[in-house]
């Protein structure tokens, strides 16, 4: 929102830590939808739907000393973006990831504004602000030429390849390491 | 030279299931993610999902959510698509397509489709 | 989901004829804009991805333009065998959705 009155809020980003996806402990080469409500998080028998969740998040905002009367309620977007498309290679000892399809991310979509009364103690004036908060989820490409720092938080089953690197044959008989089938929904 | 070949045309109930397979040759099966994209008698093009063949990984479009299957053969670089619960709304050709990439524009697209499968769903 | 929309549905045109078509993303989709030919009957075909990159052995008489949310094919001399449809289909946003198609006949 571009407003003068709009404020970020301290702290209002700082999610929790959203729990591991659970493990799915493939045993055929298969990948099954159980048709799980669209924003219900972490059910193992649909890991493989586009399921870039909507989680519902409460909160208070606070502002210094000052705290919202209410407590607001956003989303924070949560999940994987489809099955994993990195390819373990593996070339004598040296193993090395490359893609075999655009990387993805789950990020806000829309943003809502929505106004709050923060009450202050000792006997402060209480004080309206106006927050941004996340309405909409969706899984949006990211490029490689993305900064290496909005990586930071995925494990190596999404790091990318380095940059110009062309994607090599996949040496004969490699496979995919625990790592990849455990997240690859 | 690069291929997928798809199964025959089907004709099915309301309710009843169909598994439509595209076979892969001409390239390392396992090195690239299997789509399928559908198109309605005189419609356009609707893209379902894909499955990762090396790890058995899927993700279908929401549309489809709880009818779609995506399975994969690396014995037979075979890829199978189940859908279930038809409805005659679901009267289309099927394609499977792969996905080839450009490593200069980082850019994707589908590059090789097999030649389709039509599915006719009527009572 | 990204709605792409293409105009016109339909054009009839002389061989030799200038055919520009357009597509347009309901939301900013960067350069990911790929082109499909379909013939009756047969699998849609690469033309174009990446907005302006020609697949190897299309003829240069196609060429992609655009950024963002509005891109153009244009066929800069119609040849008897560009009587086809034409999809556009964006890769930057989950999932993905091609355009209506725009069938471009013989007048």
């Known amino acids: 929102f571009k407003n003068d009155a709009t404020e970020i809020i301290p702290g209002l980003r700082e999610y929790p830590e959203p729990p591991q996806e659970l493990e799915n402990n493939q045993t055929m080469n298969r990948a099954e939808n159980g048709g799980r409500p669209p924003h219900h998080p972490y059910d193992t028998k649909d890991v493989s739907e586009y399921s870039c969740r909507e989680l519902h998040y409460t909160r208070f905002v606070t502002d210094g000393p000052c705290r919202s009367a209410k407590p607001v309620t956003e989303l924070v977007c949560s999940g994987q973006c489809g099955p994993a498309r990195l390819l373990p290679n593996a070339i004598g000892r040296v193993k090395w990831w490359r893609p075999n399809g655009p990387d993805f991310r789950c990020i806000p979509d829309r943003y809502r504004a929505q106004r709050v009364q923060l009450l202050c103690p000792g006997g402060a004036a209480p004080r309206s602000r106006k927050v941004r908060l996340v309405a909409s989820c969706k899984c949006k490409r990211l490029t490689r030429f993305h900064n290496q720092s909005e990586l930071k938080d995925f494990g190596p089953e999404t790091a990318r390849p380095q940059k110009g690197r062309k994607p090599r044959p996949r040496a004969r008989g490699a496979k995919a390491n625990q790592a990849e089938l455990e997240n690859a929904y | 030279e690069v291929q997928l070949v798809q199964s025959g045309a089907e004709v099915k109930k309301p309710g009843a299931s169909v598994k439509v397979s595209c076979k892969a040759s001409?390239?390392?099966?396992?090195?690239?993610?299997m789509h399928w994209v559908r198109q309605a008698p005189g419609q356009g093009l609707e893209w379902m999902g894909e499955?990762?063949?090396?790890?058995?990984?899927?993700g279908y479009n929401q549309k489809f959510k709880g009818r779609v299957t995506m399975t994969t053969d690396t014995s037979t670089s075979t890829a199978y698509m189940e859908l279930r619960s038809l409805r005659s709304d679901d009267t289309a050709v099927y394609y499977c397509?792969?996905?080839?990439?450009?490593?200069?524009?980082?850019?994707?697209?589908?590059?090789?489709w097999g030649q389709g499968t039509t599915v006719t769903v009527s009572s | 989901d990204i709605q792409m929309t293409q105009s016109p549905s339909s054009l009839s045109a002389s061989v030799g004829d200038r055919v520009t078509i357009t597509c347009r993303a309901s939301?900013?989709?960067?350069?990911?804009l790929n082109w499909y030919q379909q013939k009756p009957g047969k699998a849609p075909k690469l033309l174009i991805y990446h907005t302006s990159r020609l697949l190897s052995g299309v003829p240069s008489r196609f060429s992609g333009s655009g950024s963002g949310t509005d891109f153009t094919l244009t066929i800069s001399s119609l040849q008897p065998e560009d009587f086809a449809t034409y999809y556009c289909q964006q890769g930057d946003t989950l999932p993905y959705t091609f355009g209506g198609g725009t069938k471009v006949e013989i007048k």
């Open positions: 939301q900013d989709i960067s350069n990911y």
């Open positions: 499955i990762n063949p090396n790890s058995g990984g899927a």
């Open positions: 397509a792969r996905l080839g990439y450009d490593d200069i524009y980082d850019d994707w697209y589908f590059d090789v």
């Open positions: 001409g390239y390392t099966f396992t090195d690239y993610n």
